[in-house]
């Protein structure tokens, strides 16, 4: 049929909860292409009707929710003007009671569900949530051994659980829970994560480098909206936290009520020797109280600030 078979991706999935898989294969999907999903070599494409339990949503295949009978090989066909590529995705659905202590972990879970914390360090766990824009995700709750996590050492930040001064007792079974809303219906997403610990330095002794800011000032008019990127390079194996703080407090916590200043979602680009991370800070409206205050970007042991200042008056 003239299509290139690219690779087989294996995914282990939990029954009775939503799942989505995005058919992306750069640089193939970056141009003008059409994407069509099929199940088990069927000639009939997966439905695009959003009311269908299984349907295609742009380049995604979306299961609302996943069921036992959904196990199998799915193909996404990427057609360009002069090309055709087919990606095979092997989905295996399992029944897992995250609070069933008789089941000692799952051997073939994807790496997203196996995470490592570094003893004695400040570290984090990530709740991996891959869904199309049509899915609205609520706030994330975190559990350890089926109890909701509380305590001063734990902070929820976006999709991460920050753990300060990691101890041996922090190892074990975690879960992150979020309510997903799609077309007015609500679904629970519960991702189990097996968390192990290590004393090994996660970044081989090197420290992250903050490219920007550089402890510099920015001229900005009162009342304007401002977005500032913090750009960081770090080793691929790093476990460093990256965040914005003011007065030694996470900006999202400091401005918790007004939400006037917020931290953005972290993104990263992967290079051969390192990763380049970007996490921004957004000032919805710059106020007088913001001037002269150091807004600190932190990355592991590294930190750098920006300071807002009023533009010099123009006497022309």
């Amino acid at each position: 049929d003239g299509c290139n078979d690219i690779f087989m991706k294996n995914e282990m999935l939990s029954a009775s909860q939503p799942f989505a898989f995005n058919c992306t294969f750069p640089p193939i999907t970056s141009g003008e292409v059409s994407v069509t999903w099929y199940k088990n070599s069927s000639k009939i494409p997966v439905s695009k009707i959003i009311q269908s339990r299984i349907h295609q949503d742009e380049t995604w295949i979306l299961f609302l929710p996943m069921e036992w009978g959904d196990s199998g090989v799915y193909q996404c066909v990427i057609k360009g003007r002069d090309s055709c590529h087919r990606i095979h995705v092997n989905l295996t659905v399992f029944e897992k009671q995250w609070c069933d202590t008789s089941v000692k972990g799952l051997p073939n879970l994807s790496d997203e569900y196996k995470q490592i914390l570094h003893l004695g360090k400040d570290d984090s766990l990530t709740c991996h949530l891959h869904f199309p824009k049509s899915c609205i995700l609520g706030p994330i709750k975190w559990y350890k051994d089926c109890n909701e996590i509380t305590g001063e050492r734990f902070t929820v930040l976006e999709t991460r659980l920050l753990v300060s001064n990691v101890s041996a007792e922090d190892r074990g079974n975690y879960a992150c829970q979020v309510i997903l809303t799609h077309s007015g219906k609500q679904y629970e997403v519960l991702n189990g994560i097996t968390v192990s610990i290590t004393e090994r330095a996660g970044y081989g002794g090197s420290v992250p480098k903050i490219i920007y800011p550089k402890n510099n000032s920015i001229e900005v008019q009162l009342g304007t909206t401002l977005i500032v990127d913090c750009n960081i390079t770090d080793t691929k194996d790093n476990t460093n936290l990256r965040c914005w703080r003011v007065n030694n407090t996470l900006v999202d916590d400091y401005y918790n009520e007004s939400k006037r200043i917020r931290e953005g979602v972290e993104t990263h680009a992967s290079f051969r020797e390192y990763n380049l991370y970007t996490v921004n800070i957004t000032f919805l409206e710059v106020k007088m109280e913001d001037y002269g205050l150091p807004f600190m970007c932190h990355a592991g042991v590294s930190a750098a600030y920006i300071m807002l200042q009023l533009p010099a008056p123009d006497f022309r």
Partner: antibody, heavy 120, light 106 residues
Framework: QVQLQESGPGLVKPSQTLSLTCTVS??????GYWNWIRNHPGKGLEYI?????????YYNPSLKSRVTISRDTSKNQFSLKLSSVTAADTAVYYC??????????????WGQGTLVTVSS | DIQMTQSPSSLSASVGDRVTITCRAS?????MYWYQQKPGKAPKLWIY???NLASGVPSRFSGSGSGTSYTLTISSLQPEDFATYYC?????????FGQGTKLEIK
């Protein structure tokens, strides 16, 4: 059950490169830490280095200039290369991994070991 | 580098004896790991995180210590305990082993 198996030549000539491969079953090398350790005859254990879940490598500084650890995720294997060998590199070489009771540093799973003799 | 010094280097003891092996680190370490090795065999994880016994390790073994001084104790030596024991630390690179303590039958 996690199993590790070392393979490679048992005899290497001085100044040449020692090459060993560890084949892993029952676990993915894209999770955890994958270690090389050696045991000199009549002497103790020496930690050589590891390759991590992300491909990051760590080498014992005493061997760093001569050692390379790499992996082939498609075959679920990781390898050790030690260049410019001398008789002092004659040892039993082990691959090992941890993760026991959620502790990555607790090396619970070991290969059976392979004796490498450096001799002309 | 953190130097790990085990004492004694070798020890002759009888079945039923209480035996203590000490591992001293040249700097503070957070946790200690102990391995048992018998001739011609791969080492076995014996004690992890200073005091936790690995699966299958008899309860006559115990581990303790903090800072720079750690011990492995056998309350009543049995014939199958005769082996070489190694301590190891991961707190500071390089991740060093002790030189080993060879436990022999008297």
């Amino acid at each position: 059950q996690v199993q590790l198996q070392e393979s490679g030549p048992g005899l290497v000539k001085p100044s040449q490169t020692l090459s060993l491969t560890c084949t892993v079953s029952g676990a993915s090398i894209t999770s955890g830490y994958w270690n090389w350790i050696r045991n000199h005859p009549g002497k103790g254990l020496e930690y050589i280095g590891y390759i991590s879940y992300s491909g990051y490598t760590y080498y014992n500084p005493s061997l760093k200039s001569r050692v390379t650890i790499s992996r082939d995720t498609s075959k679920n294997q990781f390898s050790l290369k030690l260049s410019s060998v001398t008789a002092a590199d004659t040892a039993v070489y082990y691959c090992a991994t941890g993760g026991y009771d959620y502790v990555e540093d607790a090396l619970y799973y070991w290969g059976q070991g392979t004796l490498v003799t450096v001799s002309s | 580098d953190i130097q790990m010094t085990q004492s004694p280097s070798s020890l002759s003891a009888s079945v039923g004896d209480r035996v203590t092996i000490t591992c001293r680190a040249s700097s503070n370490v957070r946790y200690m790991y102990w391995y048992q090795q018998k001739p011609g065999k791969a080492p076995k994880l014996w004690i992890y995180l200073t005091s936790n016994l690995a699966s299958g390790v008899p309860s006559r073994f115990s581990g303790s210590g903090s800072g720079t001084s750690y011990t492995l104790t056998i309350s009543s030596l049995q014939p199958e305990d005769f082996a070489t024991y190694y301590c190891q630390q991961y707190t500071t690179s390089p991740y060093t082993f002790g030189q080993g303590t060879k436990l022999e039958i008297k």
